[in-house]
Structures are given as C-alpha cells and as structure tokens.
C-alpha cells in the first residue's frame, strides 16, 4: 500500500487532468480525492499515466467501492481495466454492452483471458441471459470469447440466438460447453433442409449424441474428417461400420489417415474385423 501523506496545498487536485502525470505516487495518493476520480473517470484514459500511477488510482477506487465499482465507473476504466484481477471483476454488476465493448477493446493484445472471461460472465449475469445483442457483441469484438463462458452461463442462450454464432466462435469450446450449445442449435436449425442444416449444425456437433449422428448418416451429409475427429468419443463408439461409412461418404477413406487418433482409434477397436474389412481400407482392430 502507498503510505499516507498530507497533500501540499499547491498540489491539491480539483479536476482530473494532464497535470497529474507529474505527480509522484504518494502525491497522487494524498491529493486525488476518490470521489472526484470516480466522477471524472471519463478523463482518465486520455491521460498517459504510468502503470505505477494507475496502481494508485485503482487503489483509490478500491477504497471508495469495496463492494465493487458501479457501472458508471467501469464504463470509463479504459487502460485501468488492465490492472483489474478476476477477483475485482467478480464484484461488478455490468449490464451495458457499451461497457463490454469498451473493455474488450482495451484488453485486445493483452494477456487477459481470465479477466475477459469474468467480465463476460458478469455481463451475462447482469443482463439475465446471453441474448442476441450480447452474442453479436462477443462475436464482433472478441471471437472465441463465447467459449470462455461456463456451461451454466451458456445454458441461458435462447435457441433463437444460436444463428448469430459463427463457426470460429466455437473453436475453443470444450465438450461440456458444446453439450449445452448443441441441443439449442438443433432446435434453432430444425426447420432447415438437409444440406443447409448440416452446414449450420456442423460447428456444434462436438456436443451431438450417438442417435443424432446416426440420424445425420441418413441425410447424405458427407461429413469431413476434421468434423468427425471433433465428435465426442462416447458418441462415436456405438456407431456401426455402415453408419460411419454413410456419415462420411467419400471421406470415409480419411479413417486410414486418422486410425491412430481418438476417436477413430477407439472406434476401430470396438468393431469386428470382418466389418472393418468391408471398408477396404486395411483398418486393423
């Protein structure tokens, strides 16, 4: 903590401006009133404070708002956001997407994945659900950030919003997140024709159960190997040789290339050798 000193009269601060960059840490601590800082947060980001000076300003705000900053302050944090820890952010209540956008822009190019994930989480909690506007904001300003949300938070996504999610937004999603998103996607795209449906559902298939994969094999989708490799192992294992053959179509030959990798390896080991032989690929169970 910065040690407390009295502010010299000539250093008294009546507004947040560029003069403050000449203040030493202890002068900032002594002379900047936290309430004034909070009221004029919109000026802070225009001033080229050092990281040490930002530490002092953060300390000021922490003292003023021990329960978490109000959104009026959060919105204007600017580069001060880089000083926030996930623990700090967890105390916030954020509802404005303008706030989210502003902070996502600041975080770009910095290693702040934990902070950003926590911020997004607070936005979802603050707004009550992961609505279309929030998803649009995330996909525009933070591709991949959707996958930083917990499965519990993702469960608040209404199926109607799924259409706004792009394949690249799901690249970093884990199995538990796709387990939550897949049924919503299936619902969202259920009225589409076979080929159009497959294009839309493909990025979500890492959450598909066996029955749905079997059903997909009836639609002549010719699933590519990259998609097949992302399927859940437990979902792939019960598929028969004929079903995998029908699911992959002409891409079935790719099984040979992937035969040592899961889920292909595990699936091969579960099949009768006679059945595997019918593929004519030399797969060994």
């Amino acid at each position: 903590d910065v040690e407390r000193t009295t502010c010299p009269p000539e250093k008294e601060v009546h507004e947040i401006d560029e003069n403050l960059i000449f203040y030493k840490k202890r002068e900032l601590e002594a002379c900047v009133d936290a309430a004034l800082l909070a009221a004029q947060m919109d000026r802070v980001d225009a001033i080229p404070f050092t990281y040490e000076q930002l530490d002092v300003l953060k300390h000021k705000l922490d003292e003023l708002y021990p329960q978490g900053y109000p959104e009026s302050v959060i919105r204007h944090l600017g580069h001060l956001f880089l000083k926030m820890s996930p623990e700090d952010i967890r105390k916030w209540n954020v509802t404005s997407l303008e706030t989210l956008k502003a902070l996502l822009k600041v975080s770009k190019g910095h290693e702040m994945s934990a902070q950003v994930a926590t911020l997004i989480d607070r936005v979802v909690v603050g707004r009550g659900q992961l609505d279309k506007d929030t998803v649009d904001t995330l996909t525009a300003f933070c591709p991949g950030c959707l996958c930083s949300l917990s499965p519990e938070r993702l469960s608040s996504v209404p199926p109607s919003v799924i259409g706004a999610v792009r394949p690249q937004d799901l690249d970093t999603c884990g199995p538990r997140q796709l387990d939550v998103l897949y049924p919503k996607a299936r619902l969202a795209f259920q009225n589409m024709s076979g080929s159009e449906y497959f294009v839309k559902i493909r990025p979500f298939l890492g959450g598909a159960p066996t029955e749905d994969l079997k059903a997909l094999s009836q639609q002549n989708v010719s699933m590519d190997l990259a998609t097949f490799m992302k399927l859940r192992r437990e979902a792939v294992l019960p598929l028969t040789v004929a079903e995998v053959q029908k699911l992959l179509g002409p891409h079935v030959e790719g099984l040979k290339v992937e035969e040592q990798h899961s889920p292909v390896r595990d699936w091969i080991l579960k099949q009768r050798q006679d059945d595997l032989d019918t593929l004519g690929l030399g797969l060994q169970g």
């Epitope: 066996t210 749905d212 079997k214 094999s217 028969t240 004929a242 079903e243």
Partner: antibody, heavy 117, light 107 residues
C-alpha cells in the same frame, strides 16, 4: 442370433386401424435403427417406416405419412407400427427389419395385414 | 424418389449356369446398393451390401459390381437353393427404394 418376430396382423376394414408389434432379440436393440417394410401379394418390397435407436427420429415415405406411426419401447425390445385410416392398397405382409446405416440386414418372418370390407 | 429398375423381370436357368441380374438407378446412388434374396413364403435375406460386400454366411458364388447408376448381381454357378426372387435396394437417399424383383426359375 438376431431374431425378429412380428405380430398383430389380421383383417381390418377400410378406414380402420391396426397396431403391429415386433419383438427383437439377439442384439442390443437400443443401438439400432429399426424399420418396417411391406410386400403386397405377388408384388415387390416397399419401405414403410424407420425409427432411430432412441426413438427421436422417424422417417416415412409419402404413401403412409400422416397415417402410419412407427414407435419403439427399448425397455421391452419391441418395435411398433400404428396404422390408421387403412386402405385396400395397404394390404400386404409387413416385415420388421433391423436397419444399419443403409442396409436392412435382418428381417422378421412377416405378418399379414388384409384391408377389406 | 429414386427409381430402381431390374432386368430381366424373370429368367430361367439351369443348375451350374452363370446368372447375371442388373439393376439401374434413376440417379447416382454412389455404391449404396444392396441385394436381397427371397424365397416363396419367406422373408427377404440380405445377400450383398455396398454393391459388392458379401453379408456374413453368404456363399462366395454370389458377387456384385457397379457404381453410380448401373449395378450387377452375379451368381457364378447356380445351385438348387438359389432359385428365388432377387431384389436390389438403394440406400443412398430417403425414401429407400427397391427394384421390382427378378425371379430366377428352373429351366
């Protein structure tokens, strides 16, 4: 050994209903799609319905869509075909068949449905 | 719907003969073509799937070939138990459809 045994066939009047059953054994019933295929007297084979292994998905040709309903009870290893608004042209032997990807690989012995007044 | 047309509709042959049955699809079905054998009063039995793969227990005198729209079932040396009706079936696209059948009779 895969075994499929159909039952429930009989004589029914046009416009009437009938429910066919197929008892399956010798394989893990809940792992497979199942189908009904029919054969009118002296005629060829016609696919009638298919149901996914968990019962979520059903498929029908236009000739029976809206009139026939395929269902299953995996706890009883049994497949069903509910046939409503029956017509004379539905007269046929109805076969239950295991469906694997694109193949009807095992068939029951069939049950005869006669629609006549 | 994909139409499956078999030829001939029937044929007479003797034991030991080589028999060929053809099946034509109205559009490309890749190799998703299966053959079934049906004897009078009995259920159909799968013989060949995916154009040329023999189902378990099927004698090697049965073989299949083709791709796209034209397919062939061949019995290299007809045996007494082979007199039956044979059906082709496409498994490429719903609704799955069968040929009208080819009856192989004793000459």
């Amino acid at each position: 050994e895969v075994q499929l045994v159909e039952s429930g066939g009989g004589l029914v009047q046009p416009g009437g209903s009938l429910r066919l059953s197929c008892a399956a054994s010798g394989f893990t019933f809940s792992d497979y799609f199942m189908s009904w295929v029919r054969q009118a007297p002296g005629k060829g084979l016609e696919w009638v319905a298919t149901i996914s292994n968990g019962g979520t998905y059903t498929y029908y040709p236009d000739s029976v869509k809206g009139r026939f309903t395929i269902s299953r009870d995996n706890s009883k290893n049994t497949l069903y075909l509910q046939m409503n608004s029956l017509r004379a042209e539905d007269t046929a032997v109805y076969y239950c068949a295991r469906f694997d990807g694109y193949i009807f690989d095992y068939w029951g012995q069939g049950t005869l449905v006669t629609v006549s007044s | 719907d994909i139409q499956m047309t078999q030829s001939p509709s029937s044929l007479s042959a003797s034991v030991g003969d080589r028999v060929t049955i053809t099946c034509r699809a109205s559009q490309d079905i890749s190799n998703y073509l299966n053959w079934y054998q049906q004897k009078p009063g009995k259920a159909p039995k799968l013989l060949i799937y995916y154009t040329s793969r023999l189902h378990s227990g099927v004698p090697s005198r049965f073989s299949g070939s083709g791709s796209g729209t034209d397919f062939t079932l061949t019995i290299s040396s007809l045996q007494p138990e082979d007199f039956a009706t044979y059906y082709c079936q496409q498994g490429n696209t719903l609704p799955y459809t069968f040929g009208q059948g080819t009856k192989v009779e004793i000459k």
